[in-house]
Interface confidence: medium
Amino acid sequence: KSSNEATNITPKHNMKAFLDELKAENIKKFLYNFTQIPHLAGTEQNFQLAKQIQSQWKEFGLDSVELAHYDVLLSYPNKTHPNYISIINEDGNEIFNTSLFEPPPPGYENVSDIVPPFSAFSPQGMPEGDLVYVNYARTEDFFKLERDMKINCSGKIVIARYGKVFRGNKVKNAQLAGAKGVILYSDPADYFAPGVKSYPDGWNLPGGGVQRGNILNLNGAGDPLTPGYPANEYAYRRGIAEAVGLPSIPVHPIGYYDAQKLLEKMGGSAPPDSSWRGSLKVPYNVGPGFTGNFSTQKVKMHIHSTNEVTRIYNVIGTLRGAVEPDRYVILGGHRDSWVFGGIDPQSGAAVVHEIVRSFGTLKKEGWRPRRTILFASWDAEEFGLLGSTEWAEENSRLLQERGVAYINADSSIEGNYTLRVDCTPLMYSLVHNLTKELKSPDEGFEGKSLYESWTKKSPSPEFSGMPRISKLGSGNDFEVFFQRLGIASGRARYTKNWETNKFSGYPLYHSVYETYELVEKFYDPMFKYHLTVAQVRGGMVFELANSIVLPFDCRDYAVVLRKYADKIYSISMKHPQEMKTYSVSFDSLFSAVKNFTEIASKFSERLQDFDKSNPIVLRMMNDQLMFLERAFIDPLGLPDRPFYRHVIYAPSSHNKYAGESFPGIYDALFDIESKVDPSKAWGEVKRQIYVAAFTVQAAAETLSEVA
């Protein structure tokens, strides 16, 4: 059979048919269905939802839908011994206690099993001591405290505001500074937009609202007890003392009403500058300790959460490819939520559900994709990307040989301003071409393309008339596929205005107030933004699975490699004397990038000209495209981060959410002026340049003519 016969492509069964089948009303209905009760990882409710999704995906027409279970380390509060923080007087009496739960939203007062706010994987403990306010607890905040202000956090309880960076990085930084406990809180400066009311009257965070979340530093390991291998029935588990990424000090989150009570008494040093002040009516003094009248009072934490090995369930659906069944395009998003999951994750899960339904409709009419499409509903993402990582560890040999692309599908919205895309450069042209074919849902852009509204609202800083596309970082389920396995990956969602704070998330993130009503009343009443995201995610999957030549453009990788080389070189050139002293040269990297650019250009020319009716040559060219991302993987991984193996991109060592380019060189250069052994430090810079140059050159050679 020819490709066309095998995939039964007729005008009715093209991308338009798939996109036209996607309906906003269905996404709305699915979101409602997925958000009526909590679906916390490891609970019976989330197992039942897994079985429901399995059943519905079968009804929609997938070839097979299986549950894949693993027994992983999770963390829960003690139901009879709640976590809280108190202010104690000199006699040890508790004169103030933080709240034990969030006031439930209207209509949800009688819902059971709402997990109270907690920091997942916090150890137990009851530390007491003086408080130090550490701003966002970023690396630079601790530099400011320790180096400039000479404030010692050793033996102190630190209080940090959420935002800017992943909470696990905050805890790691506090541990390294010697703190004995961490209090995390949401400041209105970061979680209360001016001119908007608090939930339930608007989308802002009320004073009693609290952000849950894990505080691990897994660096891509997955289940903390089985790094590198699946947590299956015969797994060998590490002891808890050897577990990967667990925090060593108690941590607890609070809302801004409770934070006010702690911060208003702070004494000691004044904030170093206005960037340390939030929006509460408190001085934002750094401490340590309380001011004069209250100087004998201390803060005490009471943390009783437990870590438990618990069964989790992924749902894996398969739509077999007609021509290349051994080539996998994966669409995955998580199902587990902290509470109702109105945005995170169910706004994404509802979109995946509708995409599956649309593909199933086409399949029932006799169509099949060229390549196999795998659909995944991941469990335990909130506990450290555990479901996706365990499944990828179990199937790593298949994935590294057969994985074409992974499209992530967590929250579909974090705002309703414009599109946001983070992806491999290989997908830039796919995203551009697709969004030019889709209608913009934005007011004022009626009849215009999504590409046009996106470009107007979020322009590329480098290329006029093009939209911004960002680097992949982490903090979501694409991590194992991209950073560990080197499978081309991408994600898309609707976002807020990009000029506002980037990493604080939306105000009600991970709170009890993240409900169906939040979305339906305030973010997307018509579900038009959800539909657009479904079209982008689904359209990418359709093209990746169905186009005869893979829709990857290797020339775009060449462009960014040059940009990243320029950037890392300019960082290094802040130390011209040391560069000279230690003979540090970037010539090998720039040479490799130049070679990559030339070889990619020639490959693209051959891609235009080859005989696409020859299945062997077609497969050969597609394999070169598929394996290009894989070629950037270093089997040894990054220093001290063996599961981050991509040489071009890794999550920032200072913020898991952000992507860093040439991370090995970047980390070697970071704060190099403070290193005790400059010769050794600059030697590591040279080694990392060598690794990067070699990897870029090796990747270039995979695109050369094969013989």
Partner: nanobody
Framework: QVQLQESGPGLVKPSQTLSLTCTVS??????????WSWVRQHPGKGLEWIGF???????HYNPSLKSRVIISVDTSKNQFSLKLNSVTAADTAVYYC???????????RGQGTLVTVSS
């Protein structure tokens, strides 16, 4: 640590030109990978993007303000500037200069300066 500081008159007469300068300290304005933008916030409203200049010199403006805006850079002084001409009372706002990058993590903003347009 990079810091940004806006400077310029706090009061501008209608129909005149608003001129602001942003001084960057703790890092070079010509560093590869960053771009330098101006945004403003009207009282009680969200942030409005005005425009940005990339380290390589390319400039982008908000289409709704394009006809009235000029953003320029002086690398020798490590400064970039905003000129907004033909101002009206609707241009009264807190004006911020900001640094961004091709990533969502590179964002950094100055303290802001209130500019009132009034005769």
């Amino acid at each position: 640590q990079v810091q940004l500081q806006e400077s310029g008159p706090g009061l501008v007469k209608p129909s005149q030109t608003l001129s602001l300068t942003c001084t960057v300290s703790g890092g070079s304005i010509s560093n590869s990978g960053y771009y330098w933008s101006w945004v403003r916030q009207h009282p009680g409203k969200g942030l409005e993007w005005i425009g940005f200049i990339y380290y390589n010199g390319s400039i982008h403006y908000n289409p709704s303000l394009k006809s009235r805006v000029i953003i320029s850079v002086d690398t020798s002084k490590n400064q970039f500037s905003l000129k907004l001409n033909s101002v009206t009372a609707a241009d009264t706002a807190v004006y911020y200069c900001a640094r961004d990058g091709d990533d969502y993590g590179d964002y950094l903003r100055g303290q802001g300066t209130l500019v009132t347009v009034s005769s």
